[in-house]
């Protein structure tokens, strides 16, 4: 027999976990003894089930974690792994401190939209992933020419709104053009938008002239490029 | 012509309140975030808060956190300041200021409109 | 919290001469999207500001052309290229990029 004891203890030395607010927050206490022993969690002191955690808490016993997704300042806090058998019982601290981020304008993924060449009659995808804290809202723009001209006289280029969404954070919003053609070739721009500002990205659609068949072996319909 | 006006200053004691209304007109204002901003006399600028355009975000200054509500009716194309607990150091002109819109801007995205200010003076 | 240092609080300058104002932030204005939110404002008393120049240096509709904004990353510039009588007042810089919002603590521009 013999008493709980750390697996890792390596991995549990960084004792102040500081998190910013809506990030996931894992906490392990790897350990092995004779019988094997059982883990709990306490959060300053009490026993700690996540009942009252909006979003719950996820308890994985085999891999001696507690794992709470999408923190908020309430969940500041001691937390303590106990580990204990018949033979006896240890226990560790994390603290952790929830930082309030500032609210920021959306944050687009680099390389999103992404230059993208596809073929007369092709189906094509356009990608925009958003960060924000606030609520983003999307648009989709093309870039068109007016009496032969893109920019009107104020400087400003002529757009066409595509298409309007309102999303969740982090979420991947995707432009679908069915079947494109010639006159689908130009720029295209994510624009994203929360109530501190607006975020711009583009990318340009390059159509080329249907393949022929008898030789073209069978192409995927898009080709992304950067 | 794109217009703000506030009303609602006045000279209040310290611990009471106020509440503060900006009207617009000339845009659409359902479409914009929309930001109080004041200026203590003689002093500098200080942003206060911001209301998103269907008023489910809003943010504030720590100095005013918990004691004043941003708050608007787009119905009526006005926004409004709630301010309670009121200090000294919120004397201040209060200004209501056009923040960005929901969509795609020639320009400048927001903080390019502001109204004419009114007055909020804290005193015993 | 950003914080915006301006510099020279005062600057008394020559009709027709050059003036500078200077501002810097206490981090990176440069965003995702490749733009710079930096706003200038000018303030006369009595009167609310007026946007002069947004994200760094595009000058906003009316505004002379001898207003112009410069810089990058968290050190910027508005350069009065002729001051005019007309441009007694007193300038602002703000951060445009997350909240809170702030503003420098402004420049007092005079004729000398």
């Known amino acids: 027999q013999q008493a709980p004891y750390w697996t890792h203890p390596q991995r549990m030395e960084k004792k102040l976990h500081a998190v910013p607010a809506g990030n996931t927050v894992k906490f392990r206490c790897p350990a092995a003894g004779n019988p094997t022993p059982t883990i709990r969690w306490l959060k300053d002191g009490q026993a700690f089930h996540g009942e009252n955690r909006i979003g719950g808490i996820r308890l994985r016993h085999q891999h001696w974690s507690l794992v709470m997704e999408s923190v908020v300042p309430s969940d500041r806090g001691t937390y303590t792994c106990l580990v204990e058998n018949a033979v006896g019982s240890i226990r560790y601290n994390y603290l952790l401190d929830v930082l309030e981020r500032s609210p920021h304008r959306p944050i687009l993924q680099a390389g999103l939209p992404a230059n993208t060449t596809a073929v007369v009659g092709s189906d094509v995808e356009l990608l925009c992933k958003v960060y924000s804290d606030a609520q983003p809202h999307i648009q989709w723009l093309k870039h068109i020419v007016i009496n032969g001209s893109s920019f009107g006289a104020d400087g400003f280029p002529y757009v066409q709104v595509l298409k309007t969404a309102d999303i969740n954070s982090s979420e991947v919003e995707v432009l679908y053009l069915r079947n494109v053609s010639a006159e689908d070739a130009g720029e295209y721009t994510c624009l994203a938008g929360n109530s501190i500002g607006l975020s711009y990205q583009s990318a340009w659609l390059t159509v080329l002239p249907e393949e022929d068949p008898t030789w073209t072996a069978a192409a995927p319909e898009a080709r992304y490029t950067d | 012509e794109v217009q703000l006006l506030e009303s609602g200053g006045g000279v209040v004691q310290p611990g009471r309140s106020l509440r503060l209304s900006c009207a617009a007109s000339?845009?659409?204002?359902?479409?914009?975030?929309m930001h109080w901003v004041r200026q203590a006399p003689g002093k500098g600028l200080e942003w206060v808060a911001v209301?998103?355009?269907?008023?489910?975000?809003?943010y504030y200054a720590d100095s005013v956190k918990g004691r004043f509500t941003i708050s608007r009716d787009n119905s009526k194309n006005t926004l409004s300041l709630q301010m309670n607990s009121l200090r000294v150091e919120d004397t201040a002109i209060y200004y209501c200021?056009?923040?960005?819109?929901?969509?795609?801007?020639?320009?400048?995205?927001?903080?390019?409109?502001w109204g004419q200010g009114t007055m909020v003076t804290v005193s015993s | 919290d950003i914080v915006m240092t301006q510099s020279p609080d005062s600057l008394a300058v020559s009709l027709g001469e050059r003036a500078t104002i200077n501002c810097k932030s206490s981090?990176?204005?440069?965003?995702?999207?490749?733009?710079?939110?930096v706003y200038w404002y000018q303030q006369k008393p009595g009167q609310p500001p007026k946007l002069l120049i947004y994200?760094?240096?595009n000058r906003f509709s009316g505004v002379p052309d001898r207003f112009s904004g410069s810089g990058s990353g968290t050190d910027f510039t508005l350069t009065i290229s002729s001051l005019q009588a007309e441009d007694v007042a007193v300038y602002y810089c703000?951060?445009?990029?997350?909240?809170?919002?702030?503003f420098g603590g402004g420049t007092k521009v005079e004729i000398k």
């Open positions: 200021v056009r923040g960005a819109g929901r969509g795609y801007t020639y320009g400048p995205d927001g903080f390019d409109i």
């Open positions: 000339g845009f659409t204002f359902s479409s914009y975030a």
């Open positions: 209301i998103s355009y269907d008023g489910s975000n809003k």
């Open positions: 981090q990176s204005l440069l965003h995702s999207d490749g733009k710079t939110y």
């Open positions: 994200e760094l240096s």
């Open positions: 703000m951060q445009y990029i997350e909240a809170p919002l702030t």
